[in-house]
């Protein structure tokens, strides 16, 4: 039994049943129709949640583009709307159903007016260039330290096997083109750069494309020539904060740091009566630091919830890394409840949170 | 031209420690890494850490993790390796090697490549 | 850890003969490995990166495939500085592991 691709051209709102896997179909459809794509799952047992890609990006619902778990409505279609579609699990990216759809400009009659640009049904699986590991292609920006090596990737296929090409900001990229030259592996759907320089900073691209179509991804290439430094943070955070007792406050503080940085927020105590040690030294208790499961982006803020007048006074933003360390401060004054409500008459300056 | 020189190597007693250097001259020192790899007198190669040299990070092997830190002093382009609570199993020749970093766009990994190495010095961890 | 077993653990070639080195990982490590030569008492020399990327100054006659679990190092035509041990090193899973070596030796 031939494994082989149903060439057929459909007319408006007609709705296609799924290739089994490992087929992949030729569709054609007219400007102006109802693209519909129709995935069962396989074996008729349960599918579990999918997603739709056409051309290695993730479809994006909108009022023209209906996703469904099982169909893929495209209301209106245009030219734009050409490419490779497939359906996949969302868990594993497992591809249930390739599509490879193309829209002419004119409206679909039922006959094949451009059948010359079609591939016969020959038994074997042809179509356009997809992506086959577009979950592996999510990395659009690459920031690397100089003196390193880049590799762009954009593994694809399709029938007859597609070529790829690079360009660079639009233009075509040849190995002349930049002292070390590159090096390619069209097996291996790469372009590999040593030893990246600032002049090598830009925009990447890979044309993958064979007679049925064309598909592109863009890379951009960050060079960093940054000396190490300790942390920055930004100026004015954490700021200066007012708070009526029992309610709640956030501190901010923004890092920025090449190095991975360590970030720790302290209150300042008193020892004794005193507020620094002998060798003068703030006395400081260590609120919150990196844990196991703790981000950096939760670090960069301090939630303290159902403040009393034990919480108010210095806090700081402590950020370390290899290079040094970073701190700025921020005083928290706590109101009593029935200062806030005068306060707030007379000014409005004074919040609750 | 690329250069690396280790020294310290020597001889130690069990528990006992040494600390390695390695100078590094001829590449933009802060850029890539610095990994240790050790050999056996009669047998392999074996990796033992690696530092980033821009942002200090670092990365060990099981059999090393706790004993050994790597560091660096970038104002004089040279990497070390701190090894405390020596045994007799790490004696070996050290090799310092430079390390660049392979910066893929798939899968969000980089893959680390040794292409520069120094001369390699001998511990020897014996009573 | 990712065990990389090198298979053979030595051979005997001529000048001139093609020799093939094969190196398996317990697990799938990509592209991600090296090749290294290294002669006695002096330090290994990077070959062949990304399991098929001829490092710069390494003559052509050195060459690497494979991808996933399986790659190869072909010597296509073996000179005498060629005799010497060689590792490969997957760099994708931590810690980074070696091979145990292949020994190629004059017959």
């Known amino acids: 039994e031939s494994l082989g691709t149903e060439q057929r051209v459909v007319g408006r709102a007609a709705e296609v049943p799924g290739p089994e896997p490992g087929q992949q179909e030729q569709l054609v459809f007219g400007s102006g129709d109802a693209v519909e794509l129709s995935c069962p799952p396989p074996g008729g047992g349960p599918m579990g949640p999918t997603v739709w890609v056409k051309d290695g990006t993730g479809l994006v619902p909108s009022e023209r583009v209906l996703v469904g778990p099982q169909r893929l409505q495209v209301l209106n279609a245009s030219h734009e709307d050409s490419g490779a579609y497939s359906c996949r699990q969302r868990l594993t990216q497992r591809v249930l159903c390739h599509f490879s759809v193309r829209v002419t400009d004119a409206p679909s009659s039922g006959d094949d007016e451009d059948g010359e640009d079609e591939a016969e049904d020959t038994g074997v699986d042809t179509g356009a260039p997809y992506w086959t590991r577009p979950e592996r292609m999510d990395k659009k920006l690459l920031a690397v330290p100089a003196a390193n090596t880049v590799r762009f990737r954009c593994p694809a296929a399709g029938n007859p096997t597609p070529s790829i090409s690079w360009l660079k900001n639009g233009r075509e990229f040849r190995g002349e083109h930049r002292i070390g030259g590159i090096k390619l592996r069209h097996q291996q759907w790469s372009l590999v750069m040593e030893s990246v320089v600032p002049s090598d900073r830009g925009n990447y691209t890979c044309v993958v494309e064979n007679k049925f179509g064309s598909i592109r991804q863009t890379y951009t290439l960050d060079v960093l020539e940054r000396s190490p430094h300790r942390p920055i943070l930004q100026a004015g955070l954490p700021a200066n904060q007012t708070a009526v007792l029992g309610s709640d406050v956030e501190f901010h503080c923004k890092v920025y740091s090449d190095a991975q940085p360590h970030i720790q927020w302290l209150k300042h105590v008193e020892v004794n009566g005193s507020k620094v040690g002998p060798d003068g030294t703030p006395y400081v208790t260590v609120l919150k630091t990196a844990g196991a499961n703790t981000t950096d982006k939760e670090l960069e803020v301090l939630s303290l919830h159902n403040v009393t007048f034990e919480d108010a006074g210095e806090y700081t933003c402590l950020a370390g890394n290899s290079i040094g360390f970073s701190h700025h401060s921020a005083w928290l004054v706590v109101l009593p409840a029935e200062e806030e409500l005068v306060e707030a008459d007379e000014a409005g300056s004074v919040y609750a949170g | 031209e690329v250069q690396l020189v280790e020294s310290g190597g020597g001889l130690v007693q069990p528990g006992g420690s040494l600390r390695l250097s390695c100078a590094a001259s001829g590449f933009p020192f802060t850029s890539t890494g610095i990994s240790w790899v050790r050999q056996a007198p009669g047998k392999g190669l074996e990796w033992v850490g690696r530092?980033?040299?821009?942002?200090?990070?670092?990365n060990y092997a099981d059999s090393v993790k706790g004993r050994f830190t790597i560091s660096a002093d970038t104002s004089k382009n040279t990497a070390y390796l701190q090894m405390n609570s020596l045994r007799a199993e790490d004696t070996a020749v050290y090799y310092c090697?430079?390390?660049?970093?392979?910066?893929?766009?798939?899968?969000?990994?980089?893959?680390?490549?040794?292409?520069?190495w120094g001369q390699g010095t001998l511990v020897t961890v014996s009573s | 850890d990712i065990q990389m077993t090198q298979s053979p653990s030595s051979l005997s070639a001529s000048v001139g003969d093609r020799v093939t080195i094969t190196c398996r990982a317990s697990?799938?490590?990509?592209?991600?490995l090296a090749w290294y030569k290294q002669k006695p008492g002096k330090a290994p020399k990077l070959l062949i990166y990304s399991a098929s990327f001829l490092y710069s100054g390494v003559p052509s006659r050195f060459s690497g495939s494979g991808s996933g679990t399986d790659f190869t190092l072909t010597i296509s035509s073996l000179q005498p500085e060629d005799f010497a041990t060689y590792y490969c090193q997957q760099s994708t899973g931590h810690p980074q592991t070696f091979g145990q070596g292949t020994k190629v030796e004059i017959k």
């Open positions: 090697a430079r390390t660049y970093g392979i910066y893929d766009t798939y899968d969000m990994y980089t893959e680390y490549v040794m292409d520069y």
């Open positions: 697990q799938d490590v990509d592209t991600s």
């Open positions: 530092t980033h040299l821009g942002d200090g990070s670092t």
